[in-house]
């Protein structure tokens, strides 16, 4: 029951997180005009990953797309890439996790297969969340750098008399949405990985049996071929995926339901 709840909660948290990552990626307010030096501006600028917008005194907002690929800063391209990778991985993770949900019966899918899928989706969510957090953090770092650079030469003299204020940009709402969404996806992924441990088929309890061969007083206890037979000498229930973060190759080497006789 706890495993199903953990898996379900992990799925829901990841779903919210990925929806947030998509929302953040599409949002225009990645950077917004810093109003510290001009709080009464009638023209408000803000920028996203795909276009920049200007809200004018009339209340009208005009947005223009970045109709160039080569002319854009490499950092912006990197952020775009990270966010897209995060979305793609998250979407695949969601698809995989739907089939992995314990509460959903799909044909005669084995628990071990569901465990593998849960782990796979969990890892995908973790990487997706990390991509989003990395993307947002790179953009934030870029903003901070540009902010202090523009502060250094904030006022440039116009004919020695008139001062012109350079537009500075600060953190937009999309950054906070991205950080939170990335964090949620990451948490959801961890929860899926934890749930995976509980989903794995449990080892059957086999009591040690003494075989008394005539003339011998040696007790033979099966358990020497645990890896290949799936038989163990433990008397306590033991979850197979004790690490929770194994590679798929490692997972494959562990016993599945078919190994049991």
């Amino acid at each position: 029951m706890a495993v199903t709840a953990c898996q379900g909660l992990g799925f829901v948290v990841s779903l919210i997180g990925i929806a947030g990552i998509i929302a953040a990626t599409c949002m225009d307010q990645w950077s917004t005009q810093d109003l510290y030096n001009n709080p009464v501006t009638a023209v408000f600028n803000y920028q996203g990953l795909w276009r920049s917008c200007v809200r004018e005194s009339s209340g009208f907002t005009e947005c223009r797309g970045y109709f160039t690929l080569l002319g854009l800063p490499a950092m912006l391209q990197a952020v775009r890439a990270l966010m897209i990778v995060g979305i793609v991985l998250g979407a695949i993770g969601l698809l995989v996790s739907i089939f992995a949900l314990k509460c959903i019966r799909i044909g005669s899918m084995e628990d071990s297969a569901k465990a593998n899928m849960t782990l796979t989706s969990g890892i995908m969510f973790i990487v997706s969340g990390l991509c989003a957090i990395a993307g947002v953090s790179v953009f934030a770092n870029m903003l901070v750098t540009n902010f202090w650079m523009s502060t250094a030469n904030m006022y440039t003299g116009m004919g020695g008399m008139v001062q012109t204020v350079q537009t500075r940009y600060t953190f937009g709402a999309a950054l906070f949405v991205g950080w939170v969404a990335g964090g949620l996806t990451l948490i959801g992924g961890v929860m899926m990985c934890i749930a995976c441990r509980g989903l794995a088929p449990e080892e059957t309890n086999y009591k040690a049996v003494s075989y008394h061969a005539s003339g011998h007083s040696v007790a033979y206890k099966p358990g020497g071929f645990k890896a290949s037979t799936g038989f163990g000498s433990n008397t306590k229930n033991k979850k197979i995926y004790d690490g929770g973060a194994r590679t798929e190759d490692e997972v494959q080497s562990y016993p599945s339901k078919h190994d049991y006789v």
Epitope: V43, S52, G59, F60
Partner: antibody, heavy 115, light 113 residues
Framework: QVQLVQSGAEVKKPGASVKVSCKAS????????MHWVRQAPGQRLEWIGY????????SYNQKFKGRVTITVDTSASTAYMELSSLRSEDTAVYYC????????WGQGTTVTVSS | DIQMTQSPSSLSASVGDRVTITCRSS????????????LTWYQQKPGKAPKLLIY???TRESGVPSRFSGSGSGTDFTLTISSLQPEDFATYYC?????????FGGGTKLEIK
């Protein structure tokens, strides 16, 4: 076509208040901010403030702060500008202005403040 | 507040003349976000509301004759009427549309010589 129709001329005594209305038509009222501008006889145009009909957010010229209140009735596509504690120097033609680039102006409302 | 200074305050000219009105702002009206100058020009005739002529310092409003043109950037702007027509005799105002409070120039009254 886009049109702004303002209320009629007003004559007020000093210290009184005046409320000028501006009915909009020909466009979606909530699409643009509604600004108010006045022009005293022989003087330059003077911006009073604006309201965002979407959320009721306002911004006023410091010169009028505390004396002016701009409101809207979105259901009636009408904006209102109320100026209190009237003085003789408030005698002017009051205009409502809207649409992009502040292209559309009302016909103006003459407010005369006289004792 | 941004101060808008217009010159001359009045101007006498004849039909067919080329007229230039200048406007200077105390701060730059250039917006780096979209590379536009937020300066607007209006024409006002006696007893009438102002009429928008030019926005973004140089973009003509639809329906405005091509003889009207605007130029300039930053703090210095000009309105040019290439060939004066009888209906052009009016008062012209420049306006800061970049920062609140929105401010207007003192106006340039264009009269018939």
């Amino acid at each position: 076509q886009v049109q702004l129709v303002q209320s009629g001329a007003e004559v007020k005594k000093p210290g009184a208040s005046v409320k000028v209305s501006c009915k909009a038509s020909g466009y979606t009222f909530t699409d643009y901010n509604m600004h108010w501008v006045r022009q005293a006889p022989g003087q330059r145009l003077e911006w009073i403030g604006y309201i965002n009909p979407n959320n009721g957010g306002t911004s006023y010229n410091q010169k009028f702060k505390g004396r002016v209140t701009i409101t809207v009735d979105t259901s009636a596509s009408t904006a209102y500008m109320e100026l209190s504690s009237l003085r003789s120097e408030d005698t002017a033609v009051y205009y409502c202005v809207t649409t992009r680039y502040l292209a559309v102006w009302g016909q103006g409302t003459t407010v005369t403040v006289s004792s | 507040d941004i101060q808008m200074t217009q010159s001359p305050s009045s101007l006498s000219a004849s039909v067919g003349d080329r007229v230039t009105i200048t406007c200077r702002s105390s701060q730059s009206l250039f917006n780096s976000g979209n590379q536009k100058n937020y300066l607007t020009w209006y024409q006002q005739k006696p007893g009438k509301a102002p009429k928008l002529l030019i926005y973004w310092a140089s973009t003509r409003e639809s329906g405005v004759p091509s003889r009207f043109s605007g130029s300039g950037s930053g703090t210095d702007f000009t309105l040019t009427i290439s060939s004066l027509q009888p209906e052009d005799f009016a008062t012209y105002y420049c306006q800061n549309d970049y920062s609140y409070p929105l401010t207007f120039g003192g106006g340039t009254k264009l009269e018939i010589k």
